[in-house]
């Protein structure tokens, strides 16, 4: 008994395709060894036709493939454009020779079945409409017209010109003539179902003078397309159901025993298991749409189907497309935190992994929104301006070569809670989903800046201090000036570093930054933060207002800006931080349903890239004490 298993008999007809799945025992050796498909000769020799090593025989060129699914312990042989010459005995097997583990498969390819003369073959997918054409002679122009379906020797009427319709074809079948045509009538059958398949006879007239035509209707089930994805990666289901359902609600469902449970539809329904990691994006006016799911889990593996119906639910006799999704647990995508917790007024540093081979790719961070079909507007990117409402509190630090970038969001409020996506314009599999949970703060923040009323005077010296607790003693402290393309590190002076860690005085741990002399362009947001190497930690932000010595010109009260930092980050308090409209990154949230479009994301944005290890920002006059 062979441990390899597969179909013993496969039968099809000329011109068709077959997809033969062979199952092997789940061992590491089996997963990685050569897989083959060979044809058994009369001499006992089995000639390789295709193998996983890349071999492809001449007779299979351009019409066959072999795909290994190690996670599923299967491999699939696809053979298209079958001919009767393909009939024979085959083996699917494993091993370096064709004598290893194998399973015998018999393939029989028949001629296209012979039908009565003048039989027209109609091949349609489930849910589609067929139009059967029935020709007749002039003598039967005024006679009764009908279409019947052969059941054994009998032929049961489906529809006729006396307005009779078989109950199982009610509202689906119509008989009509086109224009002035006097020699053809037509029968439309819509919302095709598998049991509609069979031989039909259309007839005009009665008795021996009747005109008859034969029609063979094949109704094809959707053959699931196999999708093989890594754990924690993303998958896009591209659904093209045709123009006839362009105006109907669309859905993606997952097959579950007797039902197909809707995961998302265009009427606003969404499965909670996919909250924060799914987007449905219309592609065009012809009914095409795509569904993107990120953060794939083991339990996401299974059969999926997309369809269209006014109810937004699966309905028999409506067009569908099918997929089988495999989720490979041997993933190249690192396991990162799926939930990040923060407190109001505090900050979070979110590490976003990306394909290390694509360090020059553009990085983005977007906020998943549940409204309608889900969308993910970009908040920040390496070439995208920070979105309004996030100025001064959001920055992206790229760490080239490390395979990760960090997004820091500070001045947190409970409204920041929700799902965020890390994505790049490169490898589309590397899209990760993070849930941010912001709770009300119960204690003072770890980092505190003085003075809180930060107003600097042009030409003078201005020093600002950041107090940190002893737990941050060994970490690197920094000040940076926030701008639209990141937060650029400034020279600063750590006054606590001179003490030994044993005698850490909680009150005297200070890192300070001095502006000397103060310039007008020094106005803006400054961050005090801690980090260890490339790992960013807590940050706090303060707005530094800059005034003329004369104090003649009106200026916004700086305390308002820093009140915003502590209480209401979502309010826009600063006139000076509002940019001109043309500088705003106008990023289409739909970009992220399809990697082909994401590269447009930075088109309107500025060219300079954020950098976490930059020196002092341009025009900055920071100095050490």
């Amino acid at each position: 008994q062979s441990p390899i298993f597969g179909p013993q008999d496969v039968s099809s007809i000329e011109g068709n395709s077959v997809s033969i799945t062979c199952y092997y025992p789940d061992t590491s050796v089996n997963r990685h060894t050569r897989k083959y498909w060979c044809r058994q000769g009369a001499n006992g020799y089995c000639a390789t036709l295709i193998s996983s090593n890349g071999y492809l025989s001449k007779e299979y060129s351009g019409r066959a493939s072999l795909i290994n699914f190690p996670e599923n312990s299967t491999f699939v042989i696809n053979i298209a454009h079958l001919t009767q010459e393909d009939t024979g005995s085959y083996k699917c097997g494993l091993g370096t020779t064709n004598r290893g583990l194998f399973f015998d498969v018999s393939l029989e390819v028949s001629q296209v079945p012979e039908f009565p003369n003048d039989t027209h073959v109609y091949t349609k997918d489930i849910g589609r409409t067929v139009t059967i054409e029935c020709r007749f002679k002039e003598g039967n122009a005024h006679s009764k017209k009908s279409l019947c379906k052969k059941r054994g020797e009998a032929c049961e009427v489906v529809i006729d010109s006396t307005e009779y319709v078989d109950p199982s074809y009610k509202d689906r079948a119509i008989l009509f003539m086109k224009g002035t045509s006097r020699d053809i009538f037509y029968v439309n059958i819509s919302h095709l179902i598998p049991s509609d398949a069979g031989l039909y006879v259309c007839q005009a007239g009665e008795g021996p003078s009747a005109d008859k035509n034969n029609a063979d209707l094949q109704v094809l089930e959707p053959e699931p397309e196999l999708l093989y994805k890594d754990l924690r990666s993303s998958v896009t289901f591209e659904c093209d159901l045709g123009r006839e359902v362009a105006n109907d609600a669309k859905y993606l469902c997952r097959k579950n025993k007797e039902t197909c449970d809707v995961i998302i539809n265009t009427l606003g329904k969404r499965d909670p298991a996919f909250e924060g990691r799914i987007l449905l994006t219309p592609r065009d006016d012809n009914g095409r749409f795509s569904v993107l799911i990120t953060g794939l889990r083991k339990e996401d593996a299974g059969h999926y189907q997309c369809g269209a119906h006014s109810s937004g639910l699966p309905q028999e006799g409506w067009p569908v497309q099918a997929w089988q999704l495999f989720v490979n647990e041997e993933s190249t995508i690192p396991n990162s935190r799926s939930v990040v917790k923060g407190v109001t007024g505090g900050s979070v540093a979110i590490v976003c992994p990306y394909n290390p081979k694509e360090s020059s790719s553009l990085k983005y961070w977007c906020h998943w929104e549940a409204d309608e079909n889900g969308r993910c507007p970009v908040l920040v990117g390496t070439q995208a301006l920070v979105q309004e409402g996030y100025e001064g509190r959001l920055a992206l630090f790229d760490q080239p070569g490390s395979g990760a970038y960090t997004v820091i969001l500070n001045q947190l409020t409970t409204q920041d809670s929700g799902f965020y996506w890390c994505l790049t314009d490169g490898d589309s599999r590397w899209r990760t989903t993070i849930e941010l949970q912001v709770a009300e703060a119960t204690k003072k923040p770890d980092l505190e800046v003085t003075p809180q009323n930060a107003t600097a005077v042009i030409g003078e010296t201005f020093t600002i201090s950041c107090h940190y607790p002893c737990k941050f003693y060994s970490q690197e402290k920094y000040w940076c000036k926030w701008s639209n393309d990141g937060c650029h590190i400034l020279p600063s002076h750590d006054e606590g570093a001179r003490q030994s860690s044993v005698s850490c005085d909680q009150s005297s741990q200070i890192v300070s930054m001095t502006l000397n002399p103060v310039k007008k362009e020094d106005e803006g947001w400054y961050w005090c933060g801690v980090k260890e190497g490339q790992v960013y930690g807590e940050t706090t932000a303060i707005y530094v207002a800059v005034e003329e010595r004369t104090r003649g010109s009106p200026h916004i009260n700086p305390t308002d800006a820093n009140a915003r930092a502590k209480d209401a980050p979502e309010e826009e308090a600063m006139e000076s931080s509002v940019r001109e409209d043309e500088n705003k990154a106008n990023l289409d949230p739909r970009l992220f349903a399809d990697e082909r479009e994401i590269q447009n994301a930075g088109d309107q944005a500025q060219e300079n890239r954020a950098s976490g290890n930059a020196g002092s920002a341009g025009g900055q006059s920071g100095s050490s004490k």
């Epitope: 179909p7 496969v10 099809s12 398949a197 059969h303 099918a322």
Partner: nanobody, 129 residues
Framework: EVQLVESGGGLVQTGGSLRLSCAAS????????MGWFRQAPGKEPERDFV?????????????YYADSVKGRFTISRDNAKNTVYLQMNTLKPEDTAVYYC?????????????????WGQGTQVTVSS
């Protein structure tokens, strides 16, 4: 909802033949994977794979058999009647069991009973020696 009804079981002598039928009714049957499983006496709740049939359209069929029935049992389908058959020849006493018909939209592995969506009530086959 789809109902599957098995028939054709009975008592037969060793070496004899039986033909089991599985008729699908209810909601139009659009399943395109059908299988036969059996449960030997005292083996509850274990159901062993016997044979399966998958079709990707009306013209392409894949037939799967357990090693123990290869060459003796044949699975087939009549699309017009929404019926699947299991022709059992050269029956042996160890073939005695309740035979269940199962239907599914697809299966990842035809031998796994969990892959099937619909089940019949079963029909008893007894092979006497």
């Amino acid at each position: 909802e789809v109902q599957l009804v098995e028939s054709g079981g009975g008592l037969v002598q060793t070496g004899g033949s039986l033909r089991l039928s599985c008729a699908a009714s209810g909601r139009t049957f659009s399943s395109y994977a059908m299988g036969w499983f059996r449960q030997a006496p005292g083996k509850e709740p274990e159901r062993d794979f016997v044979a399966a049939l998958r079709w990707s359209n009306d013209r392409t069929y894949y037939k799967y058999y357990a090693d123990s029935v290869k060459g003796r049992f044949t699975i087939s389908r009549d699309n017009a009647k929404n019926t699947v058959y299991l022709q059992m020849n050269t029956l042996k006493p160890e073939d005695t069991a309740v035979y269940y018909c199962a239907g599914g939209n697809y299966f990842s592995d035809p031998r796994v009973d969990k892959e099937y969506n619909y089940w019949g009530q079963g029909t008893q086959v007894t092979v006497s020696s």
